[in-house]
């Protein structure tokens, strides 16, 4: 058994997350992964849940109870998405550290936008010919 | 010229995010890009990436005079980076959105954590023992 | 003070099995992940294994993968490193090595602290 | 095979600046940290960089580190360079999971 099963159940214990009424009104995360078996696809959705999981153990992290599950599901996290490694970790969290309310923040994301749009689109690297190909098409000339 | 670019650069004057200072102190999302060459991990961080420009584009809705300019982005997001897929969108959708302090979403989000660990790691469909090889060795027994 | 005292070294016979220890202070032991690095006489430095913090995964070195085994014990603040089927190349200063905390962000860095090393000298 | 590679020696004049690289043969340089570490006959290894380009609490400023992506490359530049300096340096990183790899190790010379 994977570490992080005993210390989820001792969080699920901490949060009443075992009662039956938990259940109600479908799953937060686990029917969209259903949804997505590419990889690429699941981790844009991992991306997300896994933020979602960080931000909550921050808000409980002085909480002594369960300091040491927490520890440890994060390890596990870091080890299995992150692969060990720190600095897909330390970018990831710089990400998703940025407040969209900084002005400062707000013009560099805005003078970005160009470059970080060019990228979007896995056939970005392979030139433009290939990627209007990909889109099954070209535009339109404007 | 990508149907973005005007879009963008009318959000640049509007932000004023030409000036030269914008630059000082490094990039938010450009160093990072560059850092990823795989394409799962340019997804893990592009996920949070527009998730942080879907948000900024909410703050700004109702300014008419860059509407037009955010709507054109957003669907040019949507064609590249969710390639035209509502479904995906919509499900990513749903993730940005969940509220960590809301007491119901982190009780569903605990009782559902040891599934989406499993689900974490790319080996993880492939059982345990290949997921063991993956981490080069198996845990040692607590 | 982070300390990392290395202990069981020897001399053995090719073919023959050991198991080194390493006792750490100074830290909260099971938060840290641990390396076990090598180094031939006159020769570079070459890693060994690692073992994770609280959740005990290994991870080995492709070429020392079947014969090593790294485990640990959170409770005595111990990692061990047990070595079989000895050969000669395996004559080296085996250090144990500080790893990251993966599970907090602001981590101190990785291989930081480093032991004085055992010396294994595996010889007929 | 991953590998990094370094120059097997440098040397220079004291007061002078030394750089040794460190190349990464598959893999992108930037997708990992790079540490770089100092040996001294008969001790452990300590470490004169960390995460790329940070410094540990007691290294001098004459030590940086930074990397190239466009070469593949990471490097540490001595500058000032003294005859306490004269050691091993050996750069380190990672590959797959938590995969620990070193170099071979540049001997550095102080001359004069």
């Known amino acids: 058994q994977d570490p992080y099963v005993k210390e989820a159940e001792n969080l699920k214990k901490y949060f009443n997350a075992g009662d039956p009424d938990v259940a109600d009104n479908g799953t937060l995360f686990l029917d969209i992964l259903r949804n997505w078996k590419e990889e690429s696809d699941r981790k844009i959705m991992q991306s997300q849940i896994v933020s979602f999981y960080f931000k909550l153990f921050k808000n409980f992290k002085d909480d002594q109870r369960i300091q040491k599950s927490v520890e440890t599901i994060k390890e596990d996290i870091n080890v299995k998405f992150f692969n060990s490694n720190k600095k897909k970790r330390d970018d990831f969290e710089k990400l998703t550290n940025y407040s969209v309310t900084d002005s400062n923040v707000q013009r560099k994301a805005v003078h970005e936008l160009i470059q970080v749009m060019a990228e979007l689109s896995p056939a970005a690297k392979i030139g433009k010919r290939k990627r209007s190909q990909m889109f099954r098409g070209r535009r339109a000339s404007q | 010229q990508d149907p973005y670019v005007k879009e963008a650069e009318n959000l640049k004057k509007y932000f004023n995010a030409g000036d030269p200072d914008v630059a000082d102190n490094g990039t938010l999302f450009l160093d990072i890009l560059r850092n990823w060459k795989e394409e799962s991990d340019r997804k893990i961080m592009q996920s949070q990436i527009v998730s942080f420009y879907f948000k900024l584009f909410k703050n700004f809705k109702d300014d008419q005079r860059i509407q037009k300019s955010v709507e054109t982005i957003k669907e040019d997001i949507n064609v590249k980076f969710f390639n035209s897929n509502k479904k995906k969108r919509d499900d990513f959708e749903k993730l940005t959105n969940y509220s960590v302090t809301d007491s119901n979403v982190q009780r569903k989000a605990v009782h559902e954590l040891i599934q989406v660990m499993a689900e974490l790691s790319p080996a993880a469909k492939i059982g345990k023992r290949k997921r063991s090889q993956m981490f080069r060795g198996r845990r040692a027994s607590q | 003070e982070v300390q990392l005292v290395e202990s069981g070294g020897g001399l053995v016979k090719p073919g023959d099995s050991l198991t080194v220890s390493c006792v750490a202070s100074g830290f909260t032991f099971s938060n840290y992940f641990i390396h076990w690095v090598r180094q031939a006489p006159g020769k570079g430095l070459e890693w060994v294994a690692t073992?994770?913090?609280?959740?005990?995964?290994?991870f080995y070195s492709d070429s020392l993968r079947g014969r090593f085994t790294v485990s640990r014990d959170n409770a005595q603040n111990s990692v061990y490193l047990h070595m079989s089927s000895l050969r000669g190349e395996d004559t080296a200063l085996y250090y144990c090595?500080?790893?990251?905390?993966?599970?907090?962000?602001?981590?101190?860095?990785?291989?930081?602290?480093w032991g004085r090393g055992t010396l294994v000298t595996v010889s007929s | 095979n991953f590998m990094l590679t370094q120059p097997l020696s440098v040397s220079g004049y004291p007061g002078k600046t030394i750089v040794i690289s460190c190349v990464r043969s598959?893999?992108?340089?930037?997708?990992?940290?790079v540490q770089w570490f100092q040996q001294r006959p008969g001790s452990a290894p300590a470490m004169v960089i960390y995460e790329d380009s940070h410094r540990p609490s007691g290294i001098p400023d004459r030590f940086s580190g930074s990397v190239d992506a466009s070469s593949n490359s990471a490097s540490l530049t001595i500058s000032g360079l003294k005859t306490e300096d004269e050691a091993d340096y050996f750069c380190?990183?990672?590959?797959?999971?938590?995969?620990?790899?070193f170099g071979g190790g540049t001997k550095l010379t102080v001359l004069g």
């Open positions: 598959s893999g992108s340089v930037a997708s990992h940290y």
């Open positions: 090595v500080r790893g990251y905390d993966h599970s907090d962000s602001n981590s101190a860095a990785d291989l930081l602290h």
């Open positions: 073992i994770s913090g609280r959740t005990k995964y290994m």
């Open positions: 380190q990183s990672y590959y797959g999971n938590n995969q620990v790899l």
